[in-house]
């Protein structure tokens, strides 16, 4: 680190003093300080002199030495005041410009450190400073306001206490400028517009920034449009407004309107398109199939996006049949807006019943008319069997009823023992029957089967199984005859709900 | 109001079946739903399916082969029977009202354990 | 089947305490959540349908909220008789229930 001296970190001298500041580093070493007038320079490889034999008031504040060839970047500082009784300040600028937020150092250097006890901070003709300003001072830096505002760009004076009277200094004018962040902010208004042929439209596009200087402008396609420009200030932002208003649009106002606006952090653009139709208009559609199918006991949604112009007068679903005259209940029903002419209407069916399978119907009513969506709801059941023993044409027959959705399979076993289940070790026959024979197969109902199985003689020792299964799920009945007759019954003596 | 009571055997032997039976007081047993919701010991609730008032039923799939819920309206009782108990079917069963979306009457449950 | 989890497991609150149990389903379920309390050696009891409804007789402290995937009951200010466990259900598809929350009292 270079060493000063003398070896002090202040020295006071009067006007007209002579001042020696010698420098010594271990290699070369440079002097640093204020712009200031008749300094002699004397370099002698690793020690510089500085030095006056005229010093004024404007020689007064800090210099440093520094070493350029050290890694560590040293230097040493020593605090020159000349006491002018003349003048109590030194002003190194009579400008600083700084950005909102920060510190804005004005560099009135006091001349006479005796003087600091009466130093303040005014305005130039003697104006108090703004509320809220928070402000420090340093006798070898000056006056720093902390956290400068915009509105504290004002012309500042120091003044000193120098026998009972004060004494301003030139003055310093600060600019305090605000920080852009970027290009102005915009809205376009609406985001999407659709106006039948001869109805009146208006789209408004306005930018705001911190800072006045900015442009905005309005295009319709790639053509800028000429439209008188309204101005104003608030929330501390300048804001401009360009409304275009159309009485009766037609098909050539329609297209892509850019709403732009640019300052010297860039530019913001923001887009919105304008249909002109000739009728209002009326679109029903899904993602989802029209035709449902879902297992008994699920839930399920209906989904439909409407695209209208004008808006909806009306909309409901409706349950068209074929079982009960139910109808959803409107707290099933949602409602979502996507934007002004898109939505989507939703209808919740939780845990299905069977009574709930059939058509649901949309239907929605605009202007343009009245439109319909309907969907088809198949519910899926898990097979239900039963099984009786008859005499068909003279021969005995065990006949199987299953009846579920999708169609049902069915497979019969014969098993040794008395079982409510056969179980692979028992089973003595398998027949598939890949036909069964359809009793019933209506819209939205189950499909019942009928398999038959001609047997000559029953075997008492023995059990007779009937399964039957589909996508959802498997149902069985076992059929045991016993000698006072024949004895039927599903797995573990459940009775037969149909 | 609605009360619901679980009548059950207590303890079942692994592999045998199980009988419960709901006694409902209050009101008709045709002018609502009921599930049945078991709860083993220090576990959550699991539902086991459902019977409608028209008398049809609606099982949880993992107890579709060895469930079956029926009811006797005229003595407002609903029956549980399922077979081939293990010892995991160890639970108290709770019959319970069910208006669809949600379970709002709760029976006090019958404990039912599964031990030899 | 749909999955409902429940989050904490547990959680220990003193009485005049604000508690939130959370309940996700693993697939959208509407609004059809409810919530139950169980305190021990009883059934059940119905608090909150319907993802936000109170049932009637539940106190004003218990309230529900959600939709889709995420559901959460809040007990405003935990009282000594709210020690219990709480579970969450949904009714859209077959029921299911979370795993509960079980809430102690300090």
């Known amino acids: 680190i270079p060493v000063i001296e003398p070896s002090v970190p202040e020295l006071v001298v009067k006007p007209g003093a002579t001042v020696t500041l010698r420098c010594v580093g271990n290699g070369s070493v440079e002097w640093d300080g204020p712009p200031s007038p008749h300094w002699t320079l004397y370099s002698d490889g690793s020690s510089s002199i500085l030095s006056t034999n005229n010093a004024t008031f404007q020689n007064t504040g800090t210099y440093r030495c520094t070493e350029p060839g050290d890694p560590l970047g040293g230097s040493a500082a020593i605090h020159l005041y000349v006491k002018d009784p003349a003048r109590p300040w030194n002003v190194l600028a009579q400008e600083v410009v700084v950005f909102e937020d920060q510190d804005a150092l004005l560099p009135c250097l006091l001349t006479d450190p005796v003087l600091e006890a009466g130093v303040s901070l005014v305005r130039v003709r003697g104006r108090p400073l703004m509320r809220h300003t928070n402000y420090s001072f340093s006798p070898w830096h000056g006056f720093t306001i902390h956290r400068a505002k915009f509105i504290q760009s004002q012309d500042y004076q120091c003044s000193a206490l120098m026998g009972g009277r004060k004494v301003m200094s030139i003055s310093i004018r600060l600019k305090v400028q605000k920080v852009i962040p970027g290009p102005p902010a915009l809205t376009l208004v609406p985001a999407e517009l659709v106006r039948i042929r001869g109805e009146a439209a208006q789209i408004v596009c306005s930018a705001s920034s911190v800072d006045v200087n900015f442009d905005v402008f309005l295009q319709h396609n790639n053509t800028k449009l000429a439209i008188p420009q309204q101005s104003d200030f608030h929330n501390n932002r300048y804001q401009k407004v360009l409304t275009l208003n159309l009485d009766q649009v037609d098909f050539q106002h329609a297209g892509n309107y850019s709403c732009v606006a640019s300052n010297v952090q860039g530019k913001h653009s923001t887009s919105m398109f304008f249909r002109v139709v000739e009728s209002a208009y009326l679109n029903l559609s899904s993602e989802q199939n029209l035709i449902q199918e879902v297992t008994v006991g699920e839930g399920l949604n209906l989904k439909v996006m409407v695209e209208a112009y004008p808006g909806l007068q009306g909309f409901n679903w409706t349950y068209l049949g074929p079982f009960s005259d139910h109808q959803p209940e409107p707290k099933l029903a949602n409602a979502t807006t996507k934007d002004t002419y898109r939505h989507t209407f939703t209808l919740s069916l939780p845990r299905l019943k069977p009574s709930e399978a059939g058509r649901y119907s949309f239907l929605a009513r605009n202007p343009g008319g009245w439109r319909a969506l309907t969907f088809e709801l198949t519910l899926r059941y898990p097979p239900e069997v039963s099984v009786i023993w008859t005499f068909i044409n003279g021969s005995g027959t065990l006949l199987c009823a299953a009846s579920g959705y999708p169609q049902p399979n069915v497979t019969w076993l014969q098993c040794s023992g008395h079982t409510d289940r056969c179980d692979e070790a028992q089973v003595l026959q398998v027949w598939d029957d890949p036909y069964p024979e359809v009793l019933s197969q209506e819209p939205f109902h189950k499909v019942t089967v009928q398999s038959l199985l001609t047997v000559e003689t029953l075997e008492h020792n023995q059990t007779y199984e009937c399964r039957a299964h589909n996508s959802v799920g498997s149902g069985s009945w076992a059929f045991i005859p016993i000698s006072a007759g024949a004895h039927t019954h599903p797995p573990d003596e459940f009775l037969f709900t149909p | 109001q609605v009360q619901l009571k679980e009548s059950g055997p207590g303890l079942v032997a692994p592999s045998k079946s199980l009988s419960i039976t709901c006694t409902v007081s209050g009101s008709s047993l045709d002018s609502f739903d009921i599930s049945w919701i078991r709860q083993p010991p220090g576990k959550g609730l699991e539902w086991l399916g459902v019977i409608w008032t028209g008398g049809g039923t609606n099982y949880n799939s993992g107890f579709m082969s060895r469930l079956r819920i029926s009811k006797d309206n005229s003595k407002s009782q609903v029956f549980l029977k399922m077979s081939s108990l293990q010892s995991d079917d160890t639970a108290i069963y709770y019959c319970v009202r069910d208006p669809r979306l949600y379970f709002d009457v709760w029976g006090a449950g019958t404990t039912v354990t599964v031990s030899s | 089947n749909i999955v409902m989890t429940q989050s904490p497991k547990s959680m220990s609150m003193s009485v005049g305490e604000r508690v939130t149990l959370s309940c996700k389903a693993s697939e959208d379920v509407v609004t059809y959540v409810s919530w139950y309390q169980q305190k021990p050696e009883q059934s059940p009891k119905l608090l909150i349908y319907g993802a936000s409804n109170r049932y009637t007789g539940v106190p004003d402290r218990f309230t529900g909220s959600g939709s889709a995937t995420d559901f959460t009951l809040t007990i405003s200010s935990i009282q000594a008789e709210d020690l219990a466990d709480y579970y969450c259900?949904?009714?859209?598809?077959?029921?299911?229930f979370g795993t509960g929350t079980k809430l102690e009292i300090k």
């Open positions: 259900g949904q009714t859209f598809s077959y029921p299911t």
